[in-house]
């Protein structure tokens, strides 16, 4: 009668067994085994016993004993069961960002692994169970639905394979999948709200405005704000469930036209888009031109005004006849013009808005001198010793520059608080002298002595 | 009938060598494993190293690693065991085993000196 | 390396006498430990395997126990021929290992 020890193995795949062939009777003619496992003998004393050491075990096998006995043969198998953890366990991909609300369909595959019957597959929220079956297939593919809550959000969501070898007395091994990290998302229907100027100047800043209520998280959400192909750097805000983007916007003489104003909202996998169309106008101020803005007293001056081409201007509140961007007038320089300013407002329509813009000249009239008895009385009579201000004002453009000299030489000391003497009286020759001549005229002081009186 | 007999001990200088062979006979050397073991005067046993002959896995104990090594012929069904740089420390009566895990069979062993 | 310590070095017995010889492992070994019978001047002679189980040709008297690290090679009744020196040798990892040996001696 043959025999084998152990009559039943589970062993690691790749692993070695020890296997024991035994006969009841004392001179077995033949003892040994049938296996196409590569084996070795371990050399025992004695005729009815061998031990075989079976190695590189990869699949379950069933090695025979066999003996040759006076009373015939006989055969004893023993039953190789192989155990492997699965080589591959794996969730099958999908996309990070999920919306609330959506069905998840949460699939797992497992390659390999055996026993068959002692594996499990498991699905699992963090630590909480989903699903759990057993491993069918090759490979073995198990499913469970989600429905995707705000609460899910950050959820790490894998896939365990269990082979529980602890009736065999082994262990229970444990495979584990990469996590699926879970990003829940909401992003309402509503587009988000731009805020921004309908028109604006070429070489000027504006500053747009892009909020949205409603999302979550709303800290992953990205914001774009683009003008034509200009990227914006706006400065987010978040609220619990909104966000504002304020970003500057600086064009250029490039822009100049109708642009596409953007404003996309990014989360998850889906965006909210708005869209806004801003004219970039070019609209310098309007020119003030002036024959020349320096002229003698008398000379004939034409003032013109000048506007972009599309612009309506006044002059000095006088319209351009017929309305348009150019008007002028004409005048002949008087001393009363010197500092008088012709201010031309020009208006320009840009997309339904009127722009004003104003540009003012102002006009140099050169007169004079002048020198006359209002502002330089000729004749003075102060009492001696009281206290008095010549006074002489000459008037010009340029404003002139006034000697009063008595005998050539002594000066009246116009405009000064002198204590009058008898030094102080007599003719003085006053000059107004500038650039555009010179002019004169005599002023009298007497000087009433106390012993007149 | 399971027979091992060695043979090429002797005495050596310090820093010779000697090659040592095991003769079997009863058993096919493929079929099973190949030892040595020694045993210094008045002292225990010491693994020294194993083959498997059917495909020359060897395995040798750190005080040898390096100095022995040991081999087999199939044809002449004999394992050898090559010692060099010997020591005064592997003066031992040195004896080739048959099997794996234990050691069932012995030779009768052979005498290493090493001593100048 | 794992040590193998066998336990008494030497003792004394008479004929008759139950005689115990303990191995310790210094790590678990499961059942992979073999012990030997060396009488002088011969070649070292094979008693048990695995722990426990016996081989042929050498007498019932001789029996062996034991799990993990400690072990135990028992002689239920010596006789003159069992007058030599035990060695335990383990085979759980490479090297393979033997304890110092126990030397039995006539009382």
């Known amino acids: 009668q043959t025999s084998v020890s152990p009559s039943k193995v589970i062993l690691p795949r790749g692993g070695s067994v020890l296997v024991t062939c035994s006969t009841s009777c004392d001179q077995p003619k033949l003892l040994g085994i049938e296996t196409p496992l590569p084996k070795k003998e371990l050399l025992l004393p004695g005729n009815n016993r061998k031990v075989y050491e079976l190695s590189n075990v990869q699949e379950d096998s069933q090695p025979m004993c066999y003996s040759n006995c006076p009373d015939g043969q006989s055969t004893a198998k023993t039953f190789l069961t192989v155990y492997w953890t699965p080589e591959r366990v794996e969730l099958a991909p999908l996309p990070s960002w999920q919306p609330v609300g959506k069905n998840l369909t949460l699939r797992c595959q497992v390659e390999g692994g055996a026993p068959r019957a002692n594996l499990t597959v498991v699905l699992l929220r963090g630590e909480k169970e989903l699903k759990r079956e057993p491993a069918v297939g090759e490979p073995a593919e198990v499913t469970t639905t989600v429905l995707v809550r705000r609460d899910h959000h950050g959820a790490n969501f894998s896939c365990r394979t269990e082979l529980d070898l602890r009736p065999q007395g082994l262990e229970l091994f444990e495979n584990t999948s990469a996590p699926y990290q879970l990003q829940t998302f909401v992003l309402p229907a509503t587009p988000p709200q731009l805020v921004s100027p309908r028109v604006l100047e070429v070489d000027t800043q504006g500053t747009v405005v892009c909020s949205l209520d409603g999302l979550f998280p709303v800290s992953e959400a990205q914001v774009h704000l683009a003008l034509g192909d200009q990227r914006l750097n706006p400065t987010v805000t978040y609220g619990n469930d909104s966000f504002s983007a304020k970003a500057s916007v600086s064009v250029t003489a490039e822009d100049e036209g109708t642009q596409r104003l953007t404003c996309a909202v990014i989360l998850g996998n889906q965006s909210q888009e708005t869209l806004q169309t801003v004219t970039i106008y070019s609209f310098p101020a309007p020119n003030v031109i002036l024959t020349k803005p320096e002229v003698s007293e008398g000379t004939e001056v034409t003032v013109k005004c000048e506007a972009h081409p599309r612009a309506k201007v006044t002059l000095n509140g006088v319209p351009a006849q017929p309305l348009g961007p150019r008007a002028q007038l004409l005048l002949k320089a008087t001393p009363e013009d010197n500092g008088r300013s012709f201010s031309c407002s020009a208006t320009l329509e840009v997309a339904g808005q009127l722009i004003h813009k104003n540009q003012t000249r102002e006009l140099r009239v050169l007169y004079g001198p002048r020198l006359d008895e209002r502002d330089c009385p000729g004749n003075w009579t102060w009492p001696e010793n009281s206290q008095q201000t010549p006074m002489c004002q000459a008037w010009g453009n340029p404003l002139p520059e006034l000697k009063c000299l008595k005998d050539g030489t002594f000066p009246l000391p116009i405009g000064e608080s002198v204590t009058v003497t008898r030094d102080l009286e007599g003719t003085y020759l006053c000059r107004a002298r500038s650039t555009q001549g010179e002019v004169t005229r005599k002023v009298t002081v007497n000087v009433l002595s106390p012993r007149y009186e | 009938e399971v027979q091992l007999v060695e043979s090429g001990g002797g005495l050596v200088q310090p820093g010779g060598s000697l090659r040592l062979s095991c003769a079997a006979s009863g058993f096919n050397i493929k079929d099973t494993y190949i030892h040595w073991v020694r045993q210094a005067p008045g002292k225990g046993l010491e693994w020294v190293a194993r083959i498997d002959p059917a495909n020359d896995n060897t395995i040798y104990a750190d005080s040898v690693k390096g100095r022995f090594t040991i081999s087999s012929d199939d044809s002449k069904n004999t394992a050898y065991l090559q010692m060099n740089s010997l020591r005064a420390e592997d003066t031992a009566v040195y004896y080739c085993?048959?099997?794996?895990?234990?050691?069932?069979?012995w030779g009768q062993g052979t005498l290493v000196t090493v001593s100048s | 390396d794992i040590q193998m310590t066998q336990s008494p070095s030497s003792l004394s017995a008479s004929v008759g006498d139950r005689v115990t010889i303990t191995c310790r492992a210094s790590?678990?070994?499961?059942?992979?430990l073999h012990w030997y019978q060396q009488k002088p001047g011969k070649a070292p002679k094979l008693l048990i395997y695995?722990?426990?189980q016996s081989i042929s040709g050498v007498p019932s008297r001789f029996s062996g126990s034991g799990s993990g690290t400690d072990f135990t090679l028992t002689i239920s009744s010596l006789q003159p021929e069992d007058f030599a020196t035990y060695y335990c040798?383990?085979?759980?990892?490479?090297?393979?290992?033997f304890g110092q040996g126990t030397k039995v001696e006539i009382k």
């Open positions: 085993t048959a099997s794996g895990y234990w050691f069932a069979y």
């Open positions: 695995h722990a426990s």
């Open positions: 040798q383990q085979s759980n990892s490479w090297p393979y290992t």
């Open positions: 790590q678990s070994i499961s059942n992979n």
